[in-house]
Amino acid sequence: YNNFRKSMDSIGKKQYQVQHGSCSYTFLLPEMDNCRSSSSPYVSNAVQRDAPLEYDDSVQRLQVLENIMENNTQWLMKLENYIQDNMKKEMVEIQQNAVQNQTAVMIEIGTNLLNQTAEQTRKLTDVEAQVLNQTTRLELQLLEHSLSTNKLEKQILDQTSEINKLQDKNSFLEKKVLAMEDKHIIQLQSIKEEKDQLQVLVSKQNSIIEELEKKIVTATVNNSVLQKQQHDLMETVNNLLTMMSTSNSAKDPTVAKEEQISFRDCAEVFKSGHTTNGIYTLTFPNSTEEIKAYCDMEAGGGGWTIIQRREDGSVDFQRTWKEYKVGFGNPSGEYWLGNEFVSQLTNQQRYVLKIHLKDWEGNEAYSLYEHFYLSSEELNYRIHLKGLTGTAGKISSISQPGNDFSTKDGDNDKCICKCSQMLTGGWWFDACGPSNLNGMYYPQRQNTNKFNGIKWYYWKGSGYSLKATTMMIRPADF
């Protein structure tokens, strides 16, 4: 009874032996192949890992656990059947062979068997719980993986969509760039063609201008000749009239020819009694060379020799060094008297310079320099000014000290650029300086923001092109 032993037989079946007095009871129980033997150590946390398992691994292990559970279940069922069968047989045997007092032993054995069964069942339940626990964990992980996968898939889809959009945009932009490049090439070709045409046109115009200049020179010469002839004719007529009157009044027909008087400047003309504004012939100092100049006999006491006038844009002031030297234009309109004459004139005595200006709003102003002269050509007709007064600015708009004269073909300024070519006209440019009264003539409403216009900075600023200008000189002791 108390001698209860458990062992394994040679074929791997579990063997239960109960010794009670002279009787010995042996129970043979089948052992499932896939079940863990009770003697093998059981690690309860073997399947409960913290680190997530690889998906395929988890599925595989789950299948193994399911198989184990199924096998355990089958084993239990077999055990129950076996016990029932054995119990029936044993009961029959006991009823037939054993004495009544063996019943208690049998009950005890049954109880033990039931206890064993219960233990096995508890263990199986424990395994099942663990399997369920692990299954739940795996299911959660699978769910998490699934969600994560979905999220990643969504992100990938979004990114793919974004990439597609960008690719579309890129291809659109590429097309646009190519189109622009094509357009640009066409425009460049067009500009080049235009440039070539303009160059042809410019060269044509240059040749036309040269022809016109030649014609103008010829016309001027012819005009001078005609004027001289007219003057000589008038003189002859006057002489004839004098002769006629003399021959009528006296018997002695001797003609007293009037001595020809020459004037150096308009001050001398004025002092000789000619007090009307107009064009007069002046003579170079210490020379017989003559020049025509406009004399202002009214403004500020008269006697002013006009050396420059701008009023309507009728004369081109972008001229050569030689033209600025000898003078150009029409003395009754726009003209430049000539640097050589002014240099020689101001070399003889002290002169004052008055610059009279008009804007497009009806305002007038002037700058008066008490001392003025031009150096010789050798010193590039450098301007010398001193003693500024007047209403056209307290600071001189002609840079001080004076600068050399510059033209399109005679660059004597203090700029690395060529001021005369850039701003047009000949002038005493600095670099390039606050004035240029020989700049481009701009009509009204086109006269602002012009860097190359008729400029007098300290009266109207840098971008304002004036309506009219007059530069005039007179001896300081007039």
């Epitope: 070399n347 003889q348 002290r350 001392h371 002269y373 050798e378 010193l379 450098r382 010398h384 001193k386």
Partner: nanobody
Framework: EVQLVESGGGLVQAGGSLRLSCAAS????????LGWFRQAPGKEREFVAA?????SSTDSAKDRFTISRDNAKNTVYLQMNSLKPEDTAVYYC????????????????WGQGTQVTVSS
């Protein structure tokens, strides 16, 4: 281009004499007025004497300084006698207008100057 080169300057005892020369190169200056100016340290440029093409002259110290010119040699001279320590300065030669003037404004060609030092 016209250039004026002065010479004849140097160190001299008070009461002594010096003759400055100014030679023009580049072109003839027979019609131009030629003048002498001087500038002492810390002072403004001062007129000394001038001579026209025809030989008319004006000076600030007639008794001591005499200006003359040789148009053939294209040269102007300044004879300085009875020199005083206050005559110490850099002496400049200048060419200007055809009219006589003491105003340096009307002289547009200048030499580099020559130092005259009068010691007491």
């Amino acid at each position: 281009e016209v250039q004026l080169v002065e010479s004849g300057g140097g160190l001299v005892q008070a009461g002594g004499s010096l003759r400055l020369s100014c030679a023009a190169s580049g072109r003839t200056i027979s019609s131009s007025v030629l003048g002498w100016f001087r500038q002492a340290p810390g002072k403004e440029r001062e007129f000394v004497a001038a001579i026209s093409g025809s030989g008319s002259s004006t000076d600030s110290a007639k008794d001591r300084f005499t200006i003359s010119r040789d148009n053939a040699k294209n040269t102007v001279y300044l004879q300085m006698n009875s020199l005083k320590p206050e005559d110490t300065a850099v002496y400049y030669c200048a060419a200007g207008r055809a009219f006589l003037t003491r105003d340096p404004f009307y002289y547009d060609i200048w030499g580099q100057g020559t130092q005259v030092t009068v010691s007491s």
